[in-house]
């Protein structure tokens, strides 16, 4: 009779984390009599996964009834696979011996690789706002994926970025991996509505990349431009002067009128007009009673935006 | 010697579309000599998947070298699985015969089920806008998934909806399925910023549901409220009357001033103030020279919003 062979037909099996892995094993003969065991790894440090004879293996179920006399199928199913289960699994036939059973023949092994999805990428931006023409850094992080191969791209709006650096850790073999990428983005005045996108492709995502986003509105400060003009007189002895505060972001803005250097009125911008590009405009006006002035008056519109140093624009009102 | 057995250890195998399926099969003896074949299905109509002896099977590879004299492993791998590949696969041993080889023994069969992901759900809304308190319908469609079991939920913002009807087609067995759901949503004035979400859970999505969204801003029309008021006189013989147009959506708005029924001025709203709820406000004013009027004047603010029938509000200006 041909000597018993241990057949492990699959050289490798790839399973998604959380699923069950079926590891196939068949014997070609019932003899010599003796149990089978499954191990992960080979050599002295191998780990017992299943022992037909004794022990408690709550995650392992046998595909066939191993107590049946003529059973030749010793396939097992391991439930709730995690990346820590990756490795090469050996189906090993023992023959009965004394005092202990003796290893008789091993299957060729089945390599179990575990596909674990990356966590949702988290994109974080700079701690403080920057103004247009400056460069800011965004980071993208994701964890817990396997295998190690992963592709990461950065986009600003629809356009792919090239100025970024990516690391996948650890460098050596591991049950799962993490990715960390830093992109450098040059801000423009129109970036209030812009987004940066970190896009990750991995075998577990079946062609649907994961995306993490951050709004440049959190990272940008667009300082206002000021324009002070005199409106047509509406009544005798009254001058109407407006201060047009344009294209600023974010909203927070306080405006102070000064007449010849003395504070006349302070107001906080409330009802703003939003421009298409996401910046805001605001207009304030000052009615000046010319009767109260004999000489020309210098009117100053002073604006403090988003906690920054104040900027101002002045207008000389001629008293005729 | 024990008679040859054909061992197919796995009763069932589930594979994601696009992946390869390994179907395990082992013989327990080399005799009787003769080839093996793999079939899908049983009986007269079974489909040949692989013939060890002859034929060209580009999607099938054998796990072991079947030409080796002592090979007992007849497992195969089928590449690029699609839902059309679902079925029960039998590994069948033939013994040599004349004129044809004779079927000797079949394995118990392995049922291959194919997991195919649903396409991204497409949500579409009504063809014409409706006003608050009216009900509109949204549809959600997705195709190409397998198995048939699928769960679909509707949300408006974060709140689950209950008024919807869902069909999965076809009703009988199929290689893949489609879903079509219609949800009825009651509009409210605050719905400009609202979203409806169609959420689909399927075994292939590993707990990450697919979502399709539609913005209620595409489906809603919030008609404006009008208020006509007289402002304090700015100058002798001049009355300043304003028309406050509040809480309308979408933007498109044309305003006409009439003095005693005669068109005085028509303007199209441009710089609008956006409210927190996404609706818009706009104000128009009319300076009326009271010197030109001996009698009282009726001023009418007439607004045409989003191509709908005009609404108006009048104000009687007393000429003292």
């Amino acid at each position: 009779e041909d000597e018993l062979q241990v057949i492990q037909p699959e050289k490798s099996v790839s399973v998604a984390a959380g699923e069950s892995a079926t590891l196939c094993c068949a014997m070609t003969s019932l003899i010599p009599v003796g149990p089978i065991m499954w191990f992960r790894g080979a050599g002295a440090g191998r780990e017992l996964i299943y022992n037909q004879k004794e022990g408690h293996f709550p995650r392992v179920t046998t595909v066939s009834e191993l107590t049946k006399r003529n059973n030749l199928d010793f396939s097992i199913s391991i439930s709730n696979i995690t990346p820590a289960d990756a490795g090469t699994y050996y189906c090993v036939k023992f023959r009965k011996g004394s005092p202990d059973d003796v290893e008789f023949k091993s299957g060729a092994g089945t390599e179990l690789s575990v596909r674990a999805k990356p966590s949702a990428p988290v994109v974080s931006g700079p701690a403080v706002r920057a103004t247009p023409e400056h460069t800011v850094s965004f980071t993208c992080e994701s964890h817990g994926f396997s295998p190690r191969d992963i592709t990461l791209k950065w986009f600003k709006n629809g356009n792919e970025l090239s100025d970024f650096q990516t690391n996948v850790d650890p460098a050596g073999d591991s049950v799962s991996y993490s990715i960390h990428s830093t992109a450098r983005v040059v801000l423009t005045r129109g970036d209030v509505h812009s987004q940066v996108i970190c896009e990750m492709a991995h075998i577990t995502l079946q062609g649907d990349p994961l995306r993490g986003t951050a709004n440049l509105s959190e990272a940008i400060r667009v300082p206002p431009t000021l324009e002070v003009t005199q409106q047509p007189m509406r009544a005798e002895n009254q001058a109407n002067v407006t201060c047009q505060v344009s294209n600023f972001y974010p909203r927070g803005l306080q405006l102070t009128w000064l007449e010849n250097g003395n504070v006349s009125r302070t107001e906080t911008a409330s009802t703003l007009i939003e421009n298409k590009d996401g910046t805001y405009n605001w207009m304030s006006w000052l009615l000046v009673n010319t009767c109260a002035h004999r000489d020309d008056v210098v009117l100053t519109c002073q604006v403090e935006h988003d906690g920054q140093q104040a900027v101002s624009k002045s207008y000389a009102l001629e008293i005729s | 010697e024990d008679e040859l057995q054909v061992i197919q250890p796995e009763k069932s195998v589930s594979v994601a579309a696009g992946e390869s399926a390994t179907l395990c099969c082992a013989m327990t003896s080399l005799i009787p000599v003769g080839p093996i074949m793999w079939f899908r299905g049983a009986g007269a109509g079974r489909e040949l998947i692989y013939n060890q002896k002859e034929g060209h099977f580009p999607r099938v590879t054998t796990v072991s070298e079947l030409t080796k004299r002592n090979n007992l492993d007849f497992s195969i791998s089928i590449s690029n699985i699609t839902p059309a590949d679902a079925g029960t696969y039998y590994c069948v041993k033939f013994r040599k015969g004349s004129p044809d080889d004779v079927e000797f023994k079949s394995g118990a069969g392995t049922e291959l089920s194919v997991r195919a992901k649903p396409s991204a759900p497409v949500v579409s809304g009504p063809a014409v806008r409706a006003t608050p308190e009216h009900t509109v319908s949204f549809t959600c469609e997705s195709h190409g998934f397998s198995p048939r079991d699928i769960t679909l939920k509707w949300f408006k913002n974060g709140n689950e909806l209950s008024d919807f009807q869902t069909n999965v087609d076809p009703a009988g067995d199929s290689v893949s399925y489609s879903i079509h759901s219609t949800a009825r949503v009651v509009l409210t004035r605050g719905d400009v910023h609202s979203q409806v979400i169609c959420e689909m859970a399927h075994i292939t999505l590993q707990g990450d549901p697919l979502r399709g969204t539609a913005n209620l801003s595409e489906a809603i029309r919030v008609p404006p409220t009008l208020e006509v008021t007289q402002q304090p006189m700015r100058a002798e013989n001049q009355a300043n009357v304003t028309c406050q147009v509040s809480n309308f959506y979408p933007r498109g708005l044309q305003l006409t001033w009439l003095e005693n029924g005669n068109v005085s001025r028509t303007e199209t709203a441009s710089t609008l103030i956006e409210n927190k709820d996404g609706t818009y406000n706009w104000m128009s004013w009319l300076l009326v020279n009271t010197c030109a009027h001996r009698d009282d004047v009726v001023l009418t603010c007439q607004v045409e919003h989003d191509g709908q029938q005009a609404v108006s509000k009048s104000y009687a200006l007393e000429i003292s």
Partner: antibody, heavy 120, light 107 residues
Framework: QVQLVQSGAEVKKPGASVKVSCKAS????????IVWVRQAPGQGLEWMGW????????NYAQKLQGRVTMTTDTSTSTAYMELRSLRSDDTAVYYC?????????????WGRGTLVTVSS | DIQMTQSPSSVSASVGDRVTITCRAS??????LAWYQQKPGKAPKLLIY???NLQSGVPSRFSGSGSGTDFTLTISSLQPEDFATYYC?????????FGGGTKVEIK
């Protein structure tokens, strides 16, 4: 035909030795172990020991240790059990049996038994 | 050593009766228990292996159950040829041990 054929009855004097044979046929001898079980008149079954026909490893009952030897001859597919220093309480029917369990020990094929009588 | 305690030591029954024999191990033996039938002057015959598996050729009126320490052999409808002595045997580890036997006699 799958069977175990044992040697004939023996009458021995106290202190003597006895060697019982068990010839296997109809199956692969080296694939299975052989056990020896004895049964004194009117008594139950007593396990004496086990031998691997594949490698010749043995395991004996503690009470018989030093008096019993089990051997196999794979060329003739025969197992042997020798018991030395016989006493009158060794009088029993001696059975050989094939053990067939994979992870456990059970005996699916038995010889007909050999009566060994120890008497002065 | 693992002691095997069988009860009852004898039972009187009629043809057609349901007969139950129990066997208790002094420590857990998983499912590694066998049952044998022995008739006078004959070798034992294996009925049940691994606690509940019917040996090939044995009538289906014989069944076994149990695991750990407590096991049962049931004859669902006693036949004339079933009058014999029945032994349990633990096969978990050396030394292998048998129960004391249960004699099934005609009432």
């Amino acid at each position: 035909q799958v069977q175990l054929v044992q040697s004939g009855a023996e009458v021995k004097k106290p202190g003597a030795s006895v060697k019982v044979s068990c010839k296997a046929s109809g199956y692969t001898f080296t694939g299975y172990g052989i056990v020896w079980v004895r049964q004194a008149p009117g008594q139950g079954l007593e396990w004496m020991g086990w031998i691997s026909a594949y490698a010749g490893e043995t395991n004996y009952a503690q009470k018989l240790q030093g008096r019993v030897t089990m051997t196999t001859d794979t060329s003739t597919s025969t197992a042997y059990m020798e018991l030395r220093s016989l006493r009158s309480d060794d009088t029993a029917v001696y059975y050989c049996a094939r053990e067939a369990g994979s992870s456990w020990y059970d005996f699916d094929l038995w010889g007909r038994g050999t009566l060994v009588t120890v008497s002065s | 050593d693992i002691q095997m305690t069988q009860s009852p030591s004898s039972v009187s029954a009629s043809v057609g009766d349901r007969v139950t024999i129990t066997c208790r191990a002094s420590q857990g033996i998983s499912s590694w228990l066998a049952w044998y039938q022995q008739k006078p002057g004959k070798a034992p015959k294996l009925l049940i292996y691994a606690a509940s598996n019917l040996q090939s050729g044995v009538p289906s009126r014989f069944s076994g159950s149990g695991s750990g320490t407590d096991f049962t052999l049931t004859i669902s409808s006693l036949q004339p040829e079933d009058f014999a002595t029945y032994y349990c045997q633990q096969g978990a580890s050396f030394p292998i041990t048998f129960g004391g036997g249960t004699k099934v006699e005609i009432k």
